[in-house]
Protein backbone atom coordinates (compact mmCIF):
# COMPACT_ATOMS: atom_id res chain seq x y z
CA UNK A 1 0.00 0.00 0.00
CA UNK A 2 1.12 3.55 -0.66
CA UNK A 3 1.94 5.37 2.56
CA UNK A 4 -0.15 8.52 2.78
CA UNK A 5 -1.89 10.29 -0.07
CA UNK A 6 0.60 13.11 -0.52
CA UNK A 7 3.98 12.70 -2.21
CA UNK A 8 7.13 12.85 -0.12
CA UNK A 9 8.68 15.09 -2.75
CA UNK A 10 8.15 16.39 -6.27
CA UNK A 11 10.54 17.49 -9.00
CA UNK A 12 10.39 18.86 -12.52
CA UNK A 13 12.67 17.09 -14.93
CA UNK A 14 13.09 16.33 -18.59
CA UNK A 15 13.05 12.69 -19.54
CA UNK A 16 15.43 11.20 -22.09
CA UNK A 17 16.43 7.74 -23.17
CA UNK A 18 19.74 6.04 -22.45
CA UNK A 19 20.78 7.11 -25.96
CA UNK A 20 19.84 10.74 -25.25
CA UNK A 21 16.66 10.91 -27.27
CA UNK A 22 14.03 13.16 -25.72
CA UNK A 23 10.59 12.09 -24.55
CA UNK A 24 8.15 14.69 -25.86
CA UNK A 25 4.42 15.22 -25.53
CA UNK A 26 2.16 16.72 -28.20
CA UNK A 27 -1.51 17.61 -28.10
CA UNK A 28 -3.22 16.06 -31.12
CA UNK A 29 -6.98 15.92 -31.64
CA UNK A 30 -7.68 16.73 -28.00
CA UNK A 31 -5.45 13.93 -26.72
CA UNK A 32 -1.75 13.79 -25.96
CA UNK A 33 0.71 11.69 -27.90
CA UNK A 34 4.09 10.59 -26.57
CA UNK A 35 7.14 10.63 -28.84
CA UNK A 36 10.74 9.53 -28.55
CA UNK A 37 12.84 11.72 -30.82
CA UNK A 38 16.09 13.53 -31.43
CA UNK A 39 15.56 17.15 -30.51
CA UNK A 40 16.96 20.03 -32.51
CA UNK A 41 19.55 21.86 -30.44
CA UNK A 42 17.52 25.01 -29.98
CA UNK A 43 14.33 23.23 -29.00
CA UNK A 44 13.44 23.24 -25.32
CA UNK A 45 12.96 19.85 -23.69
CA UNK A 46 9.54 18.99 -22.30
CA UNK A 47 9.41 18.81 -18.52
CA UNK A 48 7.59 16.20 -16.48
CA UNK A 49 6.39 16.59 -12.91
CA UNK A 50 7.57 13.56 -10.96
CA UNK A 51 5.75 12.94 -7.70
CA UNK A 52 7.45 10.48 -5.36
CA UNK A 53 5.47 8.26 -3.01
CA UNK A 54 6.57 5.81 -0.36
CA UNK A 55 5.13 2.34 -0.65
CA UNK A 56 5.32 -0.46 1.85
CA UNK A 57 6.22 -3.77 0.27
CA UNK A 58 3.88 -6.51 1.55
CA UNK A 59 5.81 -8.40 4.22
CA UNK A 60 4.40 -11.73 3.12
CA UNK A 61 6.11 -11.30 -0.24
CA UNK A 62 9.36 -9.75 0.86
CA UNK A 63 10.07 -11.45 4.14
CA UNK A 64 11.22 -8.04 5.32
CA UNK A 65 8.29 -7.22 7.58
CA UNK A 66 7.96 -3.45 7.76
CA UNK A 67 11.43 -2.98 6.32
CA UNK A 68 10.63 -3.27 2.64
CA UNK A 69 9.96 0.24 1.35
CA UNK A 70 9.78 1.16 -2.30
CA UNK A 71 9.76 4.51 -4.00
CA UNK A 72 6.95 4.98 -6.49
CA UNK A 73 6.51 7.81 -8.95
CA UNK A 74 3.76 9.33 -11.02
CA UNK A 75 4.67 11.32 -14.12
CA UNK A 76 2.66 14.31 -15.28
CA UNK A 77 3.80 16.31 -18.33
CA UNK A 78 0.90 18.73 -18.12
CA UNK A 79 -1.81 19.64 -15.64
CA UNK A 80 -4.32 16.86 -14.93
CA UNK A 81 -2.64 14.39 -17.32
CA UNK A 82 -0.59 11.40 -16.14
CA UNK A 83 1.34 8.62 -17.79
CA UNK A 84 -0.48 5.35 -17.33
CA UNK A 85 0.29 1.74 -18.09
CA UNK A 86 -2.13 -0.06 -20.36
CA UNK A 87 -1.17 -3.62 -19.61
CA UNK A 88 -3.63 -5.15 -22.08
CA UNK A 89 -2.20 -3.18 -25.01
CA UNK A 90 1.39 -3.17 -23.64
CA UNK A 91 1.32 0.58 -24.14
CA UNK A 92 2.04 3.75 -22.21
CA UNK A 93 -0.65 6.40 -22.52
CA UNK A 94 -1.44 9.86 -21.26
CA UNK A 95 -4.79 10.12 -19.53
CA UNK A 96 -6.64 12.94 -17.89
CA UNK A 97 -7.68 11.85 -14.43
CA UNK A 98 -8.54 13.07 -10.98
CA UNK A 99 -6.97 12.13 -7.69
CA UNK A 100 -6.77 9.61 -6.21
CA UNK A 101 -4.88 8.33 -9.22
CA UNK A 102 -5.42 4.77 -10.42
CA UNK A 103 -2.75 2.15 -9.74
CA UNK A 104 -1.86 2.20 -13.45
CA UNK A 105 -0.35 5.67 -12.94
CA UNK A 106 2.19 4.46 -10.37
CA UNK A 107 5.62 3.12 -11.24
CA UNK A 108 8.27 1.67 -8.96
CA UNK A 109 11.44 3.71 -9.39
CA UNK A 110 14.65 1.77 -9.98
CA UNK A 111 18.09 3.41 -9.91
CA UNK A 112 20.03 1.31 -12.39
CA UNK A 113 23.02 3.58 -11.89
CA UNK A 114 23.64 7.01 -10.42
CA UNK A 115 22.17 8.69 -13.46
CA UNK A 116 19.83 6.12 -15.00
CA UNK A 117 16.41 5.09 -13.82
CA UNK A 118 13.74 2.59 -14.83
CA UNK A 119 10.01 2.62 -14.22
CA UNK A 120 8.33 -0.65 -13.23
CA UNK A 121 4.55 -0.98 -13.40
CA UNK A 122 2.96 -1.15 -9.99
CA UNK A 123 0.15 -3.21 -11.50
CA UNK A 124 2.44 -5.64 -13.31
CA UNK A 125 5.78 -6.39 -11.61
CA UNK A 126 8.53 -7.22 -14.07
CA UNK A 127 7.01 -4.96 -16.72
CA UNK A 128 8.79 -1.66 -17.37
CA UNK A 129 8.31 1.47 -19.41
CA UNK A 130 10.60 1.11 -22.40
CA UNK A 131 11.30 2.36 -25.89
CA UNK A 132 9.99 0.46 -28.87
CA UNK A 133 9.86 1.84 -32.43
CA UNK A 134 10.31 5.43 -31.29
CA UNK A 135 7.41 5.18 -28.85
CA UNK A 136 7.04 4.33 -25.21
CA UNK A 137 5.75 0.82 -24.60
CA UNK A 138 5.52 -1.70 -21.79
CA UNK A 139 8.32 -4.22 -21.89
CA UNK A 140 8.51 -7.45 -19.92
CA UNK A 141 11.94 -7.88 -18.38
CA UNK A 142 13.55 -11.14 -17.40
CA UNK A 143 15.28 -10.21 -14.13
CA UNK A 144 18.04 -12.75 -14.58
CA UNK A 145 18.98 -11.62 -18.08
CA UNK A 146 17.92 -8.14 -19.14
CA UNK A 147 17.98 -6.00 -16.02
CA UNK A 148 20.43 -3.60 -17.64
CA UNK A 149 18.64 -3.59 -21.00
CA UNK A 150 19.18 -0.15 -22.51
CA UNK A 151 15.65 0.24 -23.85
CA UNK A 152 14.22 0.52 -20.32
CA UNK A 153 16.85 2.98 -19.10
CA UNK A 154 16.03 6.68 -18.82
CA UNK A 155 17.83 9.81 -17.68
CA UNK A 156 16.27 12.56 -15.62
CA UNK A 157 17.69 16.05 -15.94
CA UNK A 158 16.47 19.10 -14.08
Amino acid sequence: SITGISPITESLASLSTYNDQSITFALEDESYEIYVEDLKKDKKKDKVLLSYYESQHPSSESGDGVDGKMLMVTLSPTKDFWLQANNKEHSVELHKCEKPLPDQAFFVLHNRSFNCVSFECKTDPGVFIGVKDNHLALIKVDYSENLGSENILFKLSE
Epitope: D64, D67, G68, K69, M70, L71, R112, F114
Partner: antibody, heavy 122, light 107 residues
Protein backbone atom coordinates in the same frame (compact mmCIF):
# COMPACT_ATOMS: atom_id res chain seq x y z
CA UNK B 1 15.61 -7.29 12.43
CA UNK B 2 18.06 -5.73 9.99
CA UNK B 3 21.68 -6.43 10.89
CA UNK B 4 24.95 -5.43 9.26
CA UNK B 5 28.14 -6.85 10.75
CA UNK B 6 31.53 -5.72 9.47
CA UNK B 7 34.79 -7.64 9.84
CA UNK B 8 38.30 -7.65 8.44
CA UNK B 9 39.72 -4.47 9.92
CA UNK B 10 43.12 -4.31 11.53
CA UNK B 11 46.61 -2.87 11.40
CA UNK B 12 48.28 -2.75 7.99
CA UNK B 13 51.44 -1.10 6.68
CA UNK B 14 51.32 1.70 4.10
CA UNK B 15 51.08 0.17 0.63
CA UNK B 16 49.43 -2.94 2.02
CA UNK B 17 46.03 -4.48 1.34
CA UNK B 18 42.99 -5.42 3.38
CA UNK B 19 39.60 -6.90 2.58
CA UNK B 20 36.59 -5.86 4.62
CA UNK B 21 33.41 -7.94 4.77
CA UNK B 22 29.87 -7.09 5.80
CA UNK B 23 27.40 -9.84 6.63
CA UNK B 24 23.81 -8.71 6.10
CA UNK B 25 20.66 -10.29 7.52
CA UNK B 26 17.02 -9.50 8.20
CA UNK B 27 16.21 -8.11 4.75
CA UNK B 28 16.20 -9.04 1.08
CA UNK B 29 19.83 -8.17 0.36
CA UNK B 30 19.68 -8.23 -3.43
CA UNK B 31 16.99 -5.51 -3.53
CA UNK B 32 19.20 -2.80 -2.05
CA UNK B 33 22.08 -0.54 -3.03
CA UNK B 34 24.87 -0.94 -0.48
CA UNK B 35 27.47 1.62 0.54
CA UNK B 36 30.69 1.88 2.55
CA UNK B 37 31.21 5.05 4.60
CA UNK B 38 34.26 5.79 6.74
CA UNK B 39 35.14 8.04 9.65
CA UNK B 40 38.70 8.97 10.54
CA UNK B 41 39.36 9.23 14.30
CA UNK B 42 37.74 12.38 15.66
CA UNK B 43 36.65 13.47 12.16
CA UNK B 44 33.52 13.59 10.02
CA UNK B 45 31.92 11.06 7.70
CA UNK B 46 33.20 10.30 4.19
CA UNK B 47 31.55 8.26 1.44
CA UNK B 48 33.85 5.49 0.20
CA UNK B 49 31.98 3.29 -2.29
CA UNK B 50 28.53 2.26 -3.49
CA UNK B 51 27.24 -0.70 -5.48
CA UNK B 52 23.92 -1.02 -7.30
CA UNK B 53 21.37 -3.58 -6.19
CA UNK B 54 22.13 -5.64 -9.30
CA UNK B 55 25.87 -5.45 -8.69
CA UNK B 56 26.27 -4.05 -12.19
CA UNK B 57 27.53 -0.62 -11.18
CA UNK B 58 30.16 0.53 -8.70
CA UNK B 59 31.01 4.09 -7.69
CA UNK B 60 33.85 5.76 -5.79
CA UNK B 61 35.10 9.21 -4.82
CA UNK B 62 38.41 10.32 -6.32
CA UNK B 63 40.16 9.72 -3.00
CA UNK B 64 39.88 5.92 -3.32
CA UNK B 65 39.23 5.37 -7.04
CA UNK B 66 41.63 2.83 -8.52
CA UNK B 67 42.66 1.56 -5.09
CA UNK B 68 39.39 0.28 -3.55
CA UNK B 69 36.90 -2.17 -5.04
CA UNK B 70 33.38 -2.76 -3.75
CA UNK B 71 31.64 -6.04 -4.54
CA UNK B 72 28.72 -8.13 -3.35
CA UNK B 73 27.73 -11.78 -3.13
CA UNK B 74 23.95 -11.97 -3.08
CA UNK B 75 23.96 -15.71 -2.41
CA UNK B 76 25.82 -15.03 0.85
CA UNK B 77 24.11 -11.68 1.57
CA UNK B 78 27.57 -10.20 1.88
CA UNK B 79 29.24 -6.95 0.90
CA UNK B 80 32.99 -6.53 0.46
CA UNK B 81 35.57 -3.77 0.20
CA UNK B 82 38.97 -4.69 -1.22
CA UNK B 83 41.46 -1.99 -0.23
CA UNK B 84 44.85 -1.86 -1.96
CA UNK B 85 47.76 0.59 -1.83
CA UNK B 86 46.63 1.75 1.59
CA UNK B 87 47.78 5.11 2.91
CA UNK B 88 47.93 6.64 6.38
CA UNK B 89 44.94 8.84 5.48
CA UNK B 90 42.80 5.70 4.96
CA UNK B 91 42.93 5.09 8.73
CA UNK B 92 39.30 5.14 9.84
CA UNK B 93 36.33 3.19 11.10
CA UNK B 94 34.62 1.69 8.04
CA UNK B 95 30.83 1.32 8.14
CA UNK B 96 28.67 -0.87 5.94
CA UNK B 97 25.32 0.82 5.22
CA UNK B 98 22.09 -0.01 3.44
CA UNK B 99 19.87 2.25 1.35
CA UNK B 100 16.39 3.27 2.50
CA UNK B 101 14.38 1.89 -0.43
CA UNK B 102 14.31 -1.13 -2.68
CA UNK B 103 16.22 -0.58 -5.94
CA UNK B 104 17.00 3.02 -5.09
CA UNK B 105 19.60 5.47 -3.83
CA UNK B 106 17.18 8.05 -2.42
CA UNK B 107 16.56 8.69 1.25
CA UNK B 108 19.80 8.37 3.19
CA UNK B 109 21.12 5.37 5.13
CA UNK B 110 18.82 4.01 7.84
CA UNK B 111 20.97 0.99 8.67
CA UNK B 112 24.64 0.99 9.69
CA UNK B 113 26.93 -1.71 10.96
CA UNK B 114 28.96 -1.28 14.14
CA UNK B 115 32.04 -0.41 12.08
CA UNK B 116 35.46 -1.98 11.75
CA UNK B 117 38.68 -0.06 12.43
CA UNK B 118 41.38 0.05 9.78
CA UNK B 119 44.74 1.44 10.92
CA UNK B 120 47.40 2.15 8.31
CA UNK B 121 50.75 2.69 10.00
CA UNK B 122 54.34 1.53 9.84
CA UNK C 1 31.42 18.27 -5.85
CA UNK C 2 28.72 19.70 -3.61
CA UNK C 3 30.25 21.08 -0.42
CA UNK C 4 28.01 20.88 2.66
CA UNK C 5 28.78 23.54 5.24
CA UNK C 6 27.24 22.96 8.64
CA UNK C 7 26.82 25.66 11.27
CA UNK C 8 27.52 26.06 14.03
CA UNK C 9 30.32 23.52 14.42
CA UNK C 10 29.42 23.28 18.10
CA UNK C 11 26.86 24.71 20.47
CA UNK C 12 26.01 24.60 24.16
CA UNK C 13 22.39 24.27 25.18
CA UNK C 14 20.22 23.28 28.13
CA UNK C 15 17.55 20.62 28.42
CA UNK C 16 14.31 22.06 27.07
CA UNK C 17 16.01 24.49 24.69
CA UNK C 18 15.04 24.78 21.04
CA UNK C 19 18.08 23.99 18.91
CA UNK C 20 18.57 24.78 15.23
CA UNK C 21 21.40 23.47 13.04
CA UNK C 22 21.82 24.60 9.45
CA UNK C 23 23.41 23.02 6.42
CA UNK C 24 24.35 25.15 3.43
CA UNK C 25 25.08 23.47 0.08
CA UNK C 26 27.54 24.97 -2.41
CA UNK C 27 24.97 24.40 -5.15
CA UNK C 28 21.26 23.66 -5.26
CA UNK C 29 19.89 20.14 -5.49
CA UNK C 30 16.64 18.27 -5.05
CA UNK C 31 15.64 17.43 -1.52
CA UNK C 32 17.67 14.23 -1.05
CA UNK C 33 19.05 15.55 2.22
CA UNK C 34 19.46 13.44 5.36
CA UNK C 35 20.35 14.25 8.97
CA UNK C 36 22.17 11.85 11.30
CA UNK C 37 22.86 11.76 15.01
CA UNK C 38 26.05 10.17 16.33
CA UNK C 39 27.08 9.51 19.90
CA UNK C 40 30.69 8.75 20.90
CA UNK C 41 31.75 5.21 19.94
CA UNK C 42 28.46 4.52 18.18
CA UNK C 43 27.33 4.33 14.56
CA UNK C 44 25.39 7.24 13.07
CA UNK C 45 21.60 7.08 13.30
CA UNK C 46 19.31 8.40 10.56
CA UNK C 47 16.90 11.01 11.90
CA UNK C 48 15.51 12.79 8.84
CA UNK C 49 15.49 11.96 5.14
CA UNK C 50 14.03 13.70 2.08
CA UNK C 51 14.86 16.95 3.94
CA UNK C 52 11.79 16.75 6.17
CA UNK C 53 10.63 13.15 6.64
CA UNK C 54 11.06 11.65 10.07
CA UNK C 55 12.66 8.22 10.10
CA UNK C 56 10.60 5.53 11.83
CA UNK C 57 11.13 5.49 15.58
CA UNK C 58 12.64 8.99 15.78
CA UNK C 59 10.94 11.31 18.32
CA UNK C 60 8.74 14.04 16.84
CA UNK C 61 10.79 16.77 18.56
CA UNK C 62 13.18 16.37 15.62
CA UNK C 63 12.17 18.08 12.39
CA UNK C 64 13.82 19.02 9.13
CA UNK C 65 13.08 21.70 6.57
CA UNK C 66 14.58 23.49 3.60
CA UNK C 67 15.22 23.10 -0.11
CA UNK C 68 17.70 24.13 -2.77
CA UNK C 69 20.81 25.12 -0.86
CA UNK C 70 19.54 25.81 2.68
CA UNK C 71 18.48 23.04 5.06
CA UNK C 72 17.70 23.06 8.77
CA UNK C 73 17.45 20.48 11.55
CA UNK C 74 15.43 21.60 14.57
CA UNK C 75 15.13 19.97 17.97
CA UNK C 76 12.05 21.58 19.52
CA UNK C 77 12.86 20.72 23.13
CA UNK C 78 16.30 19.31 23.80
CA UNK C 79 16.39 16.13 25.89
CA UNK C 80 19.36 14.68 27.83
CA UNK C 81 19.76 11.90 25.24
CA UNK C 82 20.05 14.45 22.40
CA UNK C 83 23.55 15.60 23.36
CA UNK C 84 25.51 14.25 20.40
CA UNK C 85 27.05 15.22 17.07
CA UNK C 86 24.77 15.83 14.08
CA UNK C 87 25.67 15.48 10.40
CA UNK C 88 23.84 16.43 7.21
CA UNK C 89 24.33 14.49 3.96
CA UNK C 90 23.28 15.13 0.38
CA UNK C 91 22.42 12.22 -1.89
CA UNK C 92 21.34 14.06 -5.03
CA UNK C 93 24.68 14.27 -6.80
CA UNK C 94 27.80 12.18 -6.69
CA UNK C 95 30.08 12.11 -4.89
CA UNK C 96 27.86 11.85 -1.82
CA UNK C 97 28.99 14.45 0.68
CA UNK C 98 28.49 15.13 4.39
CA UNK C 99 28.58 18.27 6.46
CA UNK C 100 31.43 18.64 8.93
CA UNK C 101 29.19 18.01 11.93
CA UNK C 102 27.67 19.99 14.78
CA UNK C 103 28.47 18.96 18.34
CA UNK C 104 25.62 19.71 20.77
CA UNK C 105 26.99 19.97 24.31
CA UNK C 106 25.43 20.55 27.73
CA UNK C 107 25.56 24.16 28.90
Amino acid sequence: EVQLVESGGGLVQPGGSLRLSCAASGFTFNNYWMTWIRQAPGKGLEWVASITYTGGGTYYPDSVKGRFTISRDDAKSSLYLQMNSLRAEDTAVYYCTRANYYYNTYGGFPYWGQGTLVTVSS
Amino acid sequence: DIQMTQSPSSLSASVGDRVTITCLASEGFSNDLAWYQQKPGKSPKLLIYAASRLQDGVPSRFSGSGSGTDFTLTISSLQPEDFATYFCQQGSKYPLTFGGGTKVEIK
